[in-house]
């Protein structure tokens, strides 16, 4: 039975040109995390394999940095980055857990910054 839960930063906003950390945390399970995929609806941003390390999709290589931890740092944000992001935890023996984050990239300099996962 899958007992785990994914905690995410939820809905966050950031300024155009700025950076943001996408972060998820899997709790309430002893399952081993073998891989975390960071995805948008139709494409892969990055993979963090527990053994093999990181893969960054080429279309994001210039402005995505791995970490901290299993998180993902998005840099040089544009309004086109607004949308849903998914962290997909591949675990053994539980299977797959998915978390959702909605990022809004604002033109304004008064973007409400999303708490502890926000880069200053």
């Amino acid at each position: 039975m899958m007992t785990g839960t994914i905690e995410t930063t939820g809905n966050i906003s950031a300024e155009k040109g700025g950076s943001i950390i996408l972060q998820c945390h899997l709790s309430s399970t002893t399952a081993q995390v073998t891989q975390v995929n960071w995805e948008q609806q139709d494409q892969l941003l990055a993979i963090c394999n527990a053994d093999l390390g990181w893969h960054i999709s080429p279309s994001f290589k210039d402005r995505v940095a791995p970490g901290p931890g299993l998180g993902l740092t998005l840099q040089s944000l544009t309004v086109n980055d607004t949308g849903e992001y998914f962290c997909i935890y591949h675990t053994y023996p539980d299977g797959t857990y998915t978390g959702r984050i909605f990022l809004e990239v604002l033109e304004s300099s008064v973007a409400e910054h999303g708490a502890r996962f926000q880069i200053p």
Epitope: Q35, I47, N49, L52, S57
Partner: antibody, heavy 119, light 107 residues
Framework: QVQLVQSGAEVKKPGASVKISCKTS????????LHWVRQAPGQGLEWIGG????????SYAQKFQGRATLTVDTSTSTAYMELSSLRSEDTAVYYC????????????WGQGTLVTVSS | DIQMTQSPSSLSASVGDRVTITCRAS??????VVWYQQKPGKAPKLLIY???YRYTGVPSRFSGSGSGTDFTFTISSVQPEDFATYYC?????????FGQGTKLEIK
């Protein structure tokens, strides 16, 4: 330029083990993940597993779990693949392959090592 | 494990022909697919990755496309040196798996 140079051909008896080396040069050894792929005569490509030289982390295809062992020697920039309990079906060319920085594509390949298992 | 099914398994073409190879993943692999070329007795060579980027030095006649489960590899105008076997591979999740290969032969 990046180079992966493998050890020479081996002939082994069933039940024996073989250890193949893959000496790398032309890049920082700990930056690229190294994988092992095999190809039986006239057949396709089969991923055995990969190793992250940065931390020694290994991932294996389930078929090879417990029978293949991937290791690295960072002092000589060399990767090793040992396959135990050999059987005739393990006769194949074994390749080491390197994937680039933050990448899982196999951009760099060794020349291959033919392992023949025969009694 | 994710299965990669390539078709056709072989095809014949003449120099100058346009050829297309398809690869279907048994589940969504997003854009985590690459294509290799292999000639007899040689190691494979990376041609296309993710799945529409040409690797360094790869001629523009080679191209790739697709996302999700369906991927296509195309040679726009086959040259004599292109007769070889081509493989797709997914790296969305381990174990990384290959298609069974497509042998491109001279007609």
């Amino acid at each position: 330029q990046v180079q992966l140079v493998q050890s020479g051909a081996e002939v082994k008896k069933p039940g024996a083990s073989v250890k193949i080396s893959c000496k790398t040069s032309g890049y920082t050894f700990t930056e690229y993940t190294l994988h092992w792929v095999r190809q039986a005569p006239g057949q396709g490509l089969e991923w055995i597993g990969g190793i992250n030289p940065n931390n020694g982390g290994t991932s294996y295809a389930q078929k090879f779990q417990g029978r293949a062992t991937l290791t690295v020697d960072t002092s000589t920039s060399t990767a090793y693949m040992e396959l135990s309990s050999l059987r005739s079906e393990d006769t194949a060319v074994y390749y080491c392959a390197g994937s680039g920085y933050y990448d899982y594509s196999f951009a760099y390949w060794g020349q291959g090592t033919l392992v023949t298992v025969s009694s | 494990d994710i299965q990669m099914t390539q078709s056709p398994s072989s095809l014949s073409a003449s120099v100058g022909d346009r050829v297309t190879i398809t690869c279907r993943a048994s589940q969504d692999v997003k854009n985590a697919v690459v294509w290799y070329q292999q000639k007899p007795g040689k190691a494979p060579k990376l041609l296309i990755y993710s799945p529409s980027y040409r690797y360094t030095g790869v001629p523009s006649r080679f191209s790739g496309s697709g996302s999700g489960t369906d991927f296509t590899f195309t040679i726009s105008s086959v040259q004599p040196e292109d007769f070889a076997t081509y493989y797709c591979q997914q790296h969305y999740s381990t174990p990384f798996t290959f298609g069974q290969g497509t042998k491109l032969e001279i007609k």
